[in-house]
C-alpha cells in the first residue's frame, strides 16, 4: 500500500488548485474507512493502481488520501426550490497525479492519472446523512454513490432517500 509521503497536513502544494477554473475551499489528508472500520487501501499492481477494502493488521499504517473540497453554486432555476444553493464537491487523490474516478458504464471506481482540468468523473457531491459519516455521490450520475461491494469500491445506485443510510455507502474520514 502507498500513501502520500513528505506532505504536510493541509498541504496545498501537491496539486495545482485551478481545477475546472475553481480553487478548492480547503484540502487535507485523511484516511478513508468503511462504516464497519475496514480500510480503503491502494496498491500498485502491473503498472496500474488497485483499490482494496480490507482489515488492516494491528499497527499497519493507513493509506492517506488528499481530499480537495470545492463549492458548487446551483442557481435557483436548477435547484427547484427558488433559492440559490451551494453544495460541497470533493476530489480524492491517494497519490500525486492520480484521482478516484467514477466509471459509470462499468459501475466501478478506478484510479486514473489525470491532466488538469479534472474531468467531471473525478468529482463527487459530499453528503453527510449519518452522524460522523460521509457519502460520495457521482457528479456525473446523480443517485449513484461510491460504495463497497465484494471488498472493492463500486458505484451503487441509491433509489430512495431511505437507502442513503445503507452502510455500504457510508465512509469515515480520519486524520490520525
Amino acid at each position: 500500500a502507498f500513501g502520500i509521503s513528505g506532505v504536510q497536513k493541509y498541504t496545498r502544494a501537491l496539486h495545482d488548485s485551478s481545477i475546472t477554473g475553481i480553487s478548492p475551499i480547503t484540502e487535507y489528508l485523511a484516511s478513508l474507512s468503511t462504516y464497519n472500520d475496514q480500510s480503503i487501501t491502494f496498491a500498485l499492481e502491473d503498472e496500474s493502481y488497485e483499490i482494496y477494502v480490507e482489515d488492516l493488521k494491528k499497527d499497519e499504517k493507513k493509506d492517506k488520501v488528499l481530499l480537495s473540497y470545492y463549492e458548487s453554486q446551483h442557481p435557483s432555476n436548477e435547484s427547484g426550490d427558488g433559492v440559490d444553493g451551494k453544495m460541497l464537491m470533493v476530489t480524492l487523490s491517494p497519490t500525486k497525479d492520480f484521482w478516484l474516478h467514477a466509471n459509470n458504464k462499468e459501475h466501478s471506481v478506478e484510479l486514473h492519472k489525470c491532466e488538469k482540468p479534472l474531468p467531471d468523473q473525478a468529482f463527487f457531491v459530499l453528503h453527510n446523512m449519518h452522524s460522523n459519516c460521509v457519502s460520495f455521490e457521482c457528479k456525473t450520475d446523480p443517485g449513484v454513490f461510491i460504495g463497497v461491494k465484494d471488498n472493492h469500491l463500486a458505484l451503487i445506485k441509491v433509489d430512495s432517500s431511505e437507502n442513503l443510510c445503507t452502510e455500504n455507502i457510508l465512509f469515515k474520514l480520519s486524520e490520525t
Epitope: 446551483h74 451551494k86 449519518h130 432517500s161
Partner: antibody, heavy 121, light 107 residues
Framework: QVQLQESGPGLVKPSETLSLTCTVS????????VHWIRQPPGKGLEWLGV???????SYNSALMSRLTISEDISKSQVSLKLSSVTAADTAVYYC???????????????WGQGTLVTVSS | DIQMTQSPSSLSASVGDRVTITCLAS??????LAWYQQKPGKSPKLLIY???RLADGVPSRFSGSGSGTDFTLTISSLQPEDFATYYC?????????FGQGTKVEIK
C-alpha cells in the same frame, strides 16, 4: 426567501413534554438539514439535533433519551419533542438550516427568530 | 465530544480597533469551523464558514483563519454595529459543539 419559524407553547410544566414546530419556506427539506439549537437565558448555544436532508436524524447524546425530532414534509415542518422537562430546559429554542445541500460542514446559514420556552409550575 | 474553548470570554474595544478572537478545538476538526455573531434578543448570524469563507452579505472586515485545532476570527476595523457576542462552532463531528462565546463591548 428562506424562512424558518418556531412555534409552540411558551410555558411547560416540570415533568411534561415540550413540543415545538419549525415551519420552513423558501427551500426543500429534501435538500437541506434542519437543526435545533437552544440557549438558556444569558448563556451560550447548545446543539440539540438535526433532521438531515435524507431524513436521518442525529441527536446530542446528552439529551438523546429525552429528545425526538421528526418531520412532516407535506407541511414543510420539523418537530422537536423534549420529555421530562425541568427548569434547566428553560431556554430560547431555535431551528436553523444548513448552509450546504446535503451536508452540515458549512454551518447554519439561516435561523428562525427563536421561541422562549419556560419550564415552571 | 469535541470541546471548543474560546478566548477571551469578553473584551472591550473602541471603534476602529483590530479585534482578534481565538477558538481552540480539543481535537482536529480540519477546517470545519463556523463563526456566528449574535446581538441581544436576536438569532445568531453566520459570519464565516469552513474556517475562512465569508458568508453572503458579511462585510470584508471580518476574516477567519486556522485549521486543525487553532482558529481565529479577526475584525480588522471594529464598527459600532459589531458590538455583539461571537461564537465558534465545530461541524466535524456530532454533537456540533459551540464555544462559550466572546462578548465584544464598547470601551
Amino acid at each position: 426567501q428562506v424562512q424558518l419559524q418556531e412555534s409552540g407553547p411558551g410555558l411547560v410544566k416540570p415533568s411534561e413534554t415540550l413540543s415545538l414546530t419549525c415551519t420552513v419556506s423558501g427551500f426543500s427539506l429534501s435538500k437541506y438539514g434542519v437543526h435545533w439549537i437552544r440557549q438558556p437565558p444569558g448563556k451560550g448555544l447548545e446543539w440539540l439535533g438535526v433532521l438531515r436532508a435524507g431524513g436521518t436524524i442525529s441527536y446530542n447524546s446528552a439529551l438523546m433519551s429525552r429528545l425526538t425530532i421528526s418531520e412532516d414534509i407535506s407541511k414543510s415542518q420539523v418537530s422537536l419533542k423534549l420529555s421530562s422537562v425541568t427548569a434547566a430546559d428553560t431556554a430560547v429554542y431555535y431551528c436553523a438550516r444548513d448552509h450546504y445541500y446535503y451536508s452540515s460542514f458549512g454551518g447554519f446559514a439561516s435561523w428562525g427568530q427563536g421561541t422562549l420556552v419556560t419550564v415552571s409550575s | 465530544d469535541i470541546q471548543m474553548t474560546q478566548s477571551p470570554s469578553s473584551l472591550s474595544a473602541s471603534v476602529g480597533d483590530r479585534v482578534t478572537i481565538t477558538c481552540l478545538a480539543s481535537q482536529t476538526i480540519a477546517t470545519w469551523l463556523a463563526w456566528y455573531q449574535q446581538k441581544p434578543g436576536k438569532s445568531p448570524k453566520l459570519l464565516i464558514y469552513a474556517a475562512t469563507r465569508l458568508a453572503d452579505g458579511v462585510p470584508s472586515r471580518f476574516s477567519g483563519s486556522g485549521s486543525g485545532t487553532d482558529f481565529t476570527l479577526t475584525i480588522s476595523s471594529l464598527q459600532p454595529e459589531d458590538f455583539a457576542t461571537y461564537y465558534c462552532q465545530q461541524l466535524y463531528n456530532t454533537p456540533y459543539t459551540f464555544g462559550q462565546g466572546t462578548k465584544v463591548e464598547i470601551k
